[in-house]
Interface confidence: low
């Protein structure tokens, strides 16, 4: 899968990014800052079906995802 559980030997969590994810299917969005484990920021989306996918933090698409999550959160309040 796109998310690796192996976090040893300076390896990143994300092996591949998913270019398209329906924001409605995202349950949780986690951002992992760059550090000794991985030299780049990583974004992991936990989907409502239990799967995890990685997103590119620089992708224009991700901004849309975050905005839609924020918008849906605001509507609930």
């Amino acid at each position: 899968g796109p998310v690796s559980a192996v976090l040893t030997e300076l390896r990143c969590t994300c092996l591949r990014v998913t270019l398209r994810v329906n924001p409605k299917t995202i349950g949780k969005l986690q951002v992992f800052p760059a550090g000794p484990q991985c030299s780049k920021v990583e974004v992991v989306a936990s989907l409502k079906n239990g799967k995890q996918v990685c997103l590119d933090p620089e992708a224009p698409f991700l901004k849309k995802v975050i905005q839609k999550i924020l918008d849906s959160g605001n509507k609930k309040n």
């Epitope: 390896r11 990143c12 994300c14 092996l15 591949r16 270019l19 990685c54 992708a59 224009p60 698409f61």
Partner: antibody
Framework: QVQLQQSGAELVRPGTSVTISCKAS????????IVWVKQRPGHGLEWIGD????????FYSENFKGKATLTADTSSSTAYMHLISLTSEDSAVYFC????????????WGQGSLVTVSS | DIKMTQSPSSMSASLGERVTITCQAS??????LSWYQQKPWKSPKTLIY???RLADGVPSRFSGSGSGQDYSLTISSLESDDTATYYC?????????FGAGTKLELK
């Protein structure tokens, strides 16, 4: 700074094979994908495949399955491309490149390796 | 595979002129497009990624725009160093595919 140093020009016979190397420096090799691209005069740029050394993942263009094999030695931060059953169609400049983020745009490029197939 | 139609295939322009090169994808690639400059016997150099973002060290006279299927690279004021071949690349779908290139020369 990120650098990709490729092996030199090769003159090889038809039917033989060749291995091109791409030594990476200036970044954590196992964190990024290495991409290989072919360029022939008048044919533009063509994606061959890519490799993620951190997990041993490789993906190939349908056009290069059975032609190219991508490997890496993480201890020396070097990626390799092995080409077999060479013909004149394989005469080209081959570039390695590092992805910008995972399998996305090609941020940094090697200088290219010229392969000439001739009898 | 996604086909990238790049135009023009070649063009000539004067110093200081505004130059625009376009790429059209055969389907929506959602801004997963980058632009590369290549000079003879040299490796490609990244200019723009994600359709609009300027790569490190690239002069601000270069800019990218577009969305959906249609994208463009613009040089606001042509300099002699800009004579080269320019390629677009889509990476929204696998396999990544390049445009055929635009050869830019000075008038």
């Amino acid at each position: 700074q990120v650098q990709l140093q490729q092996s030199g020009a090769e003159l090889v016979r038809p039917g033989t094979s060749v291995t091109i190397s791409c030594k990476a420096s200036g970044y954590t090799f196992t964190n990024y994908w290495i991409v290989w691209v072919k360029q022939r005069p008048g044919h533009g740029l063509e994606w061959i495949g890519d490799l993620y050394s951190g997990g041993g993942y490789t993906f190939y263009s349908e056009n290069f399955k059975g032609k190219a094999t991508l490997t890496a030695d993480t201890s020396s931060s070097t990626a390799y491309m092995h080409l077999i059953s060479l013909t004149s169609e394989d005469s080209a400049v081959y570039f390695c490149a590092r992805s910008g983020y995972d399998r996305t745009w090609f941020a940094h490029w090697g200088q290219g390796s010229l392969v000439t197939v001739s009898s | 595979d996604i086909k990238m139609t790049q135009s023009p295939s070649s063009m000539s322009a004067s110093l200081g002129e505004r130059v625009t090169i376009t790429c059209q994808a055969s389907q929506d690639i959602e801004s997963y497009l980058s632009w590369y400059q290549q000079k003879p016997w040299k490796s490609p150099k990244t200019l723009i990624y994600y359709a609009t973002r300027l790569a490190d060290g690239v002069p601000s006279r270069f800019s990218g725009s577009g969305s959906g299927q249609d994208y463009s690279l613009t040089i606001s004021s042509l300099e002699s160093d800009d004579t080269a071949t320019y390629y677009c690349l889509q990476h929204g779908e696998s396999p990544p595919t390049f445009g055929a290139g635009t050869k830019l020369e000075l008038k």
